[in-house]
């Protein structure tokens, strides 16, 4: 399997929320054997690999942000620290998982990175991960809601949504 | 505070039985998965055992498989190991530790001796 | 299962010397691969993931590198609580194993 990542950059707006977004693609095994963890972080653009340093979001851990369950179940984070810290992870029946950050700040701007972990049972694990760049902006070169650039090309997609809401 | 306190351990004669307990604080214990690990006396470390959040799947070294148990209550944050048909080379200190998905053992107690001798 | 070979056995240095240890895949673990410190009569703590990366308050002075089956422990300049054993552990494969361990000693 693989995570595809929508869109490779967001830009938004000071106080807007966001909705970054993973996808599991390929085959997926749904079979009792197979149980899928999925989290997400922040982290640097690395000289070997993306993604490997994990760093928190907003003071959460990618521990704190974690989903795990089967295949193409559906999954929420419950955790009031998450949601005291203005984030959600979430993931549907199709592979799609994310990460809302509400009220967002200079301070959000950075990398991202989903991580998902595939566990056979009795054999190896196996681990895959997408990174996408979130730009906050302020001022009056800021846009007026979220602005999505395709990870395939370089069309850029404009989020209508309004300051405090929630959007994908 | 975030820790891990093993329990349980003492001397035992070959072929006997003990069960280590592992109290956990400090975290949700329900969101790790959890491994015991061990160490005998003046050696490396040896991975024994290894359970999901949930309870299932369960993993063991094929050193212990069949002889000891893992199992946890996530109500009561507490891991346990039952061990059975001890042997002399079972005798190390039991180290239960955190864990999870694609991560390594970034919180670990402080150990409990389980001699096995007659 | 994966044999790791940790060299050398022992190593002997004094307080403000550069460290180097070494860990040996007997196959890649691409990437997955921790090193721990342990200190007498303590529990193993978690120094570097993923072959490069430092946990949560390690010190500047470790670094990891390496993937495959060669990786490298770095201390740059012993500390005195850096006298300890220190133990690489992959997480590619089941089982998960460790290293023999390298103990760092005061010369």
């Known amino acids: 399997f693989k995570v595809a990542t929508p869109y490779s950059l967001y830009v938004c707006p000071e106080g807007q929320n966001v909705t970054l977004t993973c996808r599991l693609l390929g085959p997926v095994d749904k079979g009792h054997d197979v149980t899928f963890y999925k989290t997400w972080y922040r982290s640097s653009r690395g000289e070997v690999q993306t993604c490997s340093e994990r760093r928190p979001i907003r003071n959460l851990t990618f521990q704190d942000l974690h989903l795990h369950h089967g295949g193409h179940q559906a999954a929420n984070t419950s955790h009031d620290l998450a949601q005291r810290h203005g984030l959600e992870s979430a993931s549907d029946h199709h592979g799609n998982f994310s990460i809302t950050m509400r009220n967002l700040t200079l301070l959000d701007s950075g990398l991202y990175c989903c991580l998902v972990v595939e566990i056979r049972h009795h054999h190896s694990e196996h681990r895959v991960h997408g990174a996408m760049e979130l730009q906050v902006q302020t001022g009056k070169d800021a846009p007026s809601n979220c602005v999505v650039y395709p990870s395939s090309s370089q069309e850029s997609e404009n989020i209508t949504a309004h300051h405090h809401h929630h959007h994908h | 505070q975030v820790q891990l306190v093993e329990s349980g351990g003492g001397l035992v004669k070959p072929g006997g039985s003990l069960r280590l307990s592992c109290a956990a604080s400090?975290?949700?214990?329900?969101?790790?998965?959890m491994s015991w690990i061990r160490q005998a006396p003046g050696k490396g470390l040896e991975w024994v055992s290894y359970?999901?959040?949930?309870?299932?799947?369960?993993y063991y070294a094929d050193s212990v498989k069949g002889r000891f148990t893992i199992s946890r209550d996530n109500a009561k944050n507490s891991l346990y190991l039952q061990m059975n048909s001890l042997r002399a080379e079972d005798t190390a200190v039991y180290y239960c530790?955190?864990?999870?998905?694609?991560?390594?053992?970034?919180?670990w107690g402080r150990g409990t001796l389980v001699t096995v001798s007659s | 299962e994966i044999v790791l070979t940790q060299s050398p056995a022992t190593l002997s240095l004094s307080p403000g010397e550069r460290a180097t240890l070494s860990c040996r895949a007997s196959q890649s673990v691409s990437s997955y691969l921790a090193w721990y410190q342990q200190k007498p009569g303590q529990a193993p703590r978690l120094l570097i993931y993923d072959a490069s990366n430092r946990a949560t308050g390690i010190p500047a002075r470790f670094s990891g590198s390496g993937s495959g089956t060669d990786f490298t422990l770095t201390i740059s300049s012993l500390e005195p609580e850096d006298f300890a054993v220190y133990y690489c552990q992959q997480r590619n494969n089941w089982p998960y194993t460790f290293g023999q361990g390298t103990k760092v000693e005061i010369k």
């Open positions: 400090g975290f949700t214990f329900s969101d790790y998965y």
């Open positions: 359970i999901s959040n949930s309870g299932s799947p369960i």
């Open positions: 530790a955190r864990d999870l998905p694609g991560w390594y053992f970034d919180l």
